[in-house]
């Protein structure tokens, strides 16, 4: 296994609508074809899985059909969305990036997108 | 395990206010936010409101602004639900739910629900 | 307003029946929809959540598909328990609006 660089931003706001969206870039050492994204939250000390994706190189990513990611790739980017976000959701969202072929397998891990939800006010057609 | 009990039935009359409660047991309360759902006789599900029990904000539908209340107390696990200016179309049955949040390990919306409450609005 | 409109309001149909349920939504949800069956006199209990994910203890004949507006809830052989409405809703973000129900009778 061997250590790759990944960089994410260090924060971000949620929409009033619970959408969030950062890039994850990571420094490709040679040229993979097939790219495993995991994103992860820490929060009160533990990690949990939020969602995660494999594409070939060119190619959308595929998030499983109840996941609450989407994202596109372009290079060594990817663009990754989390909906359905609200305050309790607030917390550290680190990007993991594997690349899975061909080999050396090589891993990278961010460190972090702090992602802020804020629950609005009482008023008519708010967001939650 | 999770329960969600709440109070018992009460009979109002028109303008007055009626408060609901209902009390979390099985899990950490903090942790999920509440729902307040409604059933008049016979008729469909209305969502009522939110509240995070964390913080204790809250937000209202449309309909109820003005006329609706969510509170809780962590003491002791409780969430409540007043409603003043009461008329005879408030006359339902009224629920809790519990609500995770999206990126909680196997959490489910609304997975566990009160028994309900029915208001009767009557003069 | 956000709003949920079920199809059909009622239907009838025989056990073994593959019965499906529709629920259109006002605006893009994306996939986050819940489905629901209330039983006469019983509280609501949740069958499907984010559209397609079946609920803990649900039996494996519910089923849920869509994203966007349209959504499906699919029971692929109805059973005589199965007597009941059907509520679709939508989650996660205000106003958390309940469509307006789909009553399932037996033949």
């Known amino acids: 296994c061997k250590a790759m660089h990944v960089a994410q931003p260090a924060v971000v706001l949620a929409s009033s609508r619970g959408i969030a969206s950062f890039v994850c870039e990571y420094a490709s050492p040679g040229k993979a074809t097939e790219v495993r994204v995991t994103v992860l939250r820490q929060a009160d000390s533990q990690v949990t899985e939020v969602c995660a994706a494999t594409y070939m190189m060119g190619n959308e990513l595929t998030f499983l059909d109840d996941s609450i990611c989407t994202g596109t790739s372009s290079g060594n980017q990817v663009n990754l969305t989390i909906q359905g976000l609200r305050a309790m959701d607030t917390g550290l969202y680190i990007c993991k990036v594997e690349l899975m072929y061909p080999p050396p397998y090589y891993l990278g891990i961010g460190n972090g997108t702090q992602i802020y939800v804020i629950d609005p006010e009482p008023c008519p057609d708010s967001d939650f | 395990q999770v329960q969600l009990v709440q109070s018992g039935a009460e009979v109002q009359k028109p303008g007055a206010s009626v408060k609901v409660s209902c009390k979390a047991s099985?899990?950490?309360?903090?942790?999920?936010?509440m729902h307040w759902v409604r059933q008049a006789p016979g008729q469909g599900l209305e969502w009522m409101g939110i509240?995070?029990?964390?913080?204790?904000?809250?937000n209202y539908a449309q309909k109820f602004l003005g006329r609706v209340t969510m509170t809780r107390d962590t003491s002791t696990s409780t969430v409540y639900m007043e409603l003043s200016g009461l008329r005879s179309e408030d006359t339902a049955v009224y629920y809790c739910?519990?609500?995770?949040?999206?990126?909680?390990?196997?959490?489910?919306?609304?997975?566990?629900w009160g028994q309900g409450t029915l208001v009767t609005v009557s003069s | 307003d956000i709003q949920l409109t079920q199809s059909p309001s009622s239907l009838s149909a025989s056990v073994g029946d593959r019965v499906t349920i529709t629920c259109r939504v006002s605006?893009?949800?994306?996939?986050?929809l819940n489905w629901y069956r209330q039983k006469p006199g019983e509280i609501p209990k949740l069958l499907i959540y984010?559209?397609?994910s079946l609920q803990s203890g649900v039996p494996s004949r519910f089923s849920g598909s869509g994203s966007g507006t349209d959504f499906t809830l699919t029971i692929s052989s109805l059973q005589p328990e199965d007597i009941a409405t059907y509520y679709c809703?939508?989650?996660?973000?205000?106003?958390?609006?309940f469509g307006q129900g789909t009553k399932l009778e037996i033949k």
């Open positions: 509240i995070n029990p964390s913080g204790g904000s809250s």
């Open positions: 984010r559209a397609s």
């Open positions: 739910a519990r609500d995770p949040p999206i990126t909680m390990v196997r959490g489910a919306p609304f997975d566990y």
């Open positions: 809703q939508r989650t996660y973000s205000a106003p958390y609006t």
């Open positions: 099985g899990y950490t309360f903090t942790s999920y936010y």
């Open positions: 605006q893009d949800i994306s996939r986050l």
